[in-house]
Each structure stands twice: as C-alpha cells, then as structure tokens.
C-alpha cells in the first residue's frame, strides 16, 4: 500500500533571483484532486492553498508581493489527496538581490580576446562580504562562486568562442542575499574564421533567464511560465 504520493514540482516565476521589494510567485504542481497544498520555508509552514475545485486544478501559486531578506531561503511544498500526503518537493532556493551595494566587474586582459587566451574576471565590492558570484547571461547561467576579502578572481582559463557573452557579478552576504548586479561586461572571443560567424551567444539556451530577471527589476512584471536554473540552484546547496 502506498504511504505517500509522488513529490510535486516547485519553481519561482519569473525567477528565483528576486530584487528586494519586488514580487515573486512560487508555484507548486502536484496532482489533480489535491485538496490542500502547503508551502514550507526553512522547515516552517509558510502558506496554505486549498484548490477549488480540486479535481480540476493541479497547480497552485503562492504570491509574494514584497520580497525581503526575511523571505529569502529554501522553500519546499507538499500536497494532500484525501488523508494522504505527498513526498516533499525538491528545495527551491529563493534569493533576494539588490541588497546594499553594487560590485564592479572587470576582465583581464580585456573584453576582446583570442580563442586560447587566458581570461580572468575580477569582482570587487568594498562592503562586508567575502563571497562573490559570476553569472553569464542565458538560461544556462554558468554561475561561478569566488571568495576574497573585497575582491574575487574568476579565472576562465584558455577561452573558446563558447565563453562569448555578457557577464555580471554579485556580492553575496549569505547564500540567499545578494548585492545589486554589477554593470555588464561583454566578452568577445574571436577564433578560427569559421567560428566567427554571428552565432547566438548561447545557442543551447535561447531563452534568456537574465532578461526575465531584468524585467522583474525594471518593471515588476510577471511572466507566466517556469524558468529553471539548475546550475545556480545547485550552487546554492
């Protein structure tokens, strides 16, 4: 006899990185017929939703109108059909950004390099933080973590045309509270003649997670679709 139901899926819309005082929706998708969904935050009950009618709904949305550092952390959800509860979902890391200060991102030897050259990014923030995060635009988001008292180095090693793209960095005050994003730095990598065509910067992931994050920052608009960033989510664990 089955003791628990399959775990639901959890994600954040429009993004798991939420500028402070902006809105975010945490979505939990379980099964049709679920009479109750519970959202848990750092091990405590955060919110409850009872779909109506349950047989026609398999997803609920928990709306957070005003993101702040108290709500940044790990979320999971469960659902109930009759008296039977599901397994908990995977953990969703919700990050609050635009805290305190803005770091400076620079690149050495410069933003235009030849394939095979060694490139290092430097993220600098003069306030009290020792952890830095470097993100490349695009859904894959290639997040790297670095450490330093006021500056972190991010050596990319010998670069290829796959490293082309726009980079930003954050200072991290803890795993779930990040600074404002730095100004973008666009890395241009030139290689063999056949590789220098105007190919997309991240052809595997044409949908732009960063664009959605910026949309949240600039207008507070919601996009009604799930955007996942497993790389960044796993980095936070």
């Amino acid at each position: 006899q089955q003791q628990t139901l399959p775990k639901p899926f959890i994600w954040a819309e429009p993004h798991f990185m939420v500028p402070k005082e902006k809105q975010v929706t945490i979505c939990c998708q379980g099964n049709y017929g679920a009479v109750e969904y519970q959202l848990h935050f750092e091990g405590s009950l955060f919110a409850v939703d009872r779909p109506k009618p349950p047989e026609r709904i398999n997803k609920v949305k928990f709306y957070i109108p005003d993101m702040n550092s108290r709500m940044a952390g790990q979320y999971s959800c469960i659902y109930r059909v009759g008296e039977l509860w599901s397994e908990p979902s995977n953990l969703l890391d919700l990050v609050v950004t635009e805290m305190y200060d803005t770091p400076t991102l620079s690149v050495h030897p410069g933003p235009e390099v030849i394939s095979g050259e060694k490139v290092t990014f430097y993220c600098r923030l003069d306030t009290a933080t020792s952890m830095f995060l470097l993100l490349k635009e695009g859904r894959s988001s290639h997040v790297q973590r670095g450490y330093g008292k006021v500056q972190a180095e991010f050596p990319l090693g010998p670069v290829t045309t796959a490293h082309r793209g726009t980079y930003r960095c954050f200072g991290s005050y803890n795993n779930h509270a990040w600074s404002f994003p730095s100004e973008p730095v666009k890395l241009l990598v030139t290689g063999d003649i056949e590789n220098t065509s105007l190919a997309p910067e991240d052809p595997t992931f044409p949908a732009d997670t960063w664009g959605t994050y910026l949309l949240t920052t600039e207008t507070g608009l919601q996009k009604d679709h799930a955007l996942w960033d497993h790389t960044a989510q796993n980095l936070l664990r």
Epitope: L45, F46, A47, D49, K52, V60, Y63, P65, N68
Partner: nanobody, 126 residues
C-alpha cells in the same frame, strides 16, 4: 499604504470570550489576505489564525475549535472571536495583512505579511 488598527482587547476570566476587530484603511482590503498573531511576555511572536481573500481559514493547533477568524469586506474589517479562553492565551494580539494577494492563499508565516497593526492586549486571569 495600508493601516491596521486593532480593538477589542481587555481583561477576561478563564473560560470567557472576547472578540477582536482589525479595521483596515484603504480600498485594497478585498485583495488582502489577513492574519492574527500574538506575542506573550518574554516569548516570540506566534501565528494564531489566518484567512484568505476567498474566506479559507487556517488555525494554530493551540486555538483550533476555540477561536474563529472571519472578515467583512464591506466594513474592511477582520475579526477574531475567542472563546474558552485560558491563561496561556494572554498576549498582545497583532493583526497583519498581505497586500495584494491572489486566489486562495492563506499565509501562516509572519515573514509573508507586509503590513502590521500596533496590537491589542488580551489578559486572561481569575
């Protein structure tokens, strides 16, 4: 900007009843999820009861069957009817709101609430 003003607190004997009211200013009340929290002397603030914008309710185990939360959107007011009061119910009771919200969500965690009242004192003693 939303302002919340609680009333109805006072002193009552064990087993007695009280009804707390929370009046909200502004036209956003119908789109707000509301909750009651309490803080006893020397203790942390704790969840008591909450109601969604569509009237779904949720209660702390310690008050289930004794307290009832309700709302009147026409009066921009949320109520907490308290009966069978016990000494351990003595606390300052705070009304809180999540504005705006959508659907049936009932918020239980204090971090979710973005507006708070100043509180009203309830004392239960013989």
């Amino acid at each position: 900007e939303v302002q919340l003003v609680e009333s109805g607190g006072g002193e009552v004997q064990p087993g007695g009843s009280l009804r707390l009211s929370c009046a909200a200013s502004g036209r956003t009340f119908a789109s707000a999820a509301m909750g009651w929290f309490r803080q006893a002397p020397g203790k942390e603030r704790e969840f008591v009861a909450a109601i969604s914008r569509s009237d779904d309710t949720y209660y702390a185990e310690s008050v289930k069957g004794r307290f009832t939360i309700s709302r009147d959107n026409a009066k921009n007011t949320v109520y907490l009817q308290m009966s069978s009061l016990r000494a351990e119910d003595t606390a300052v009771y705070y009304c809180a709101a999540v504005v705006p919200t959508y659907g049936n969500t009932i918020y239980v965690h204090s971090a979710a609430y973005n507006y708070w009242g100043q509180g009203t004192l309830v004392t239960v003693k013989p």
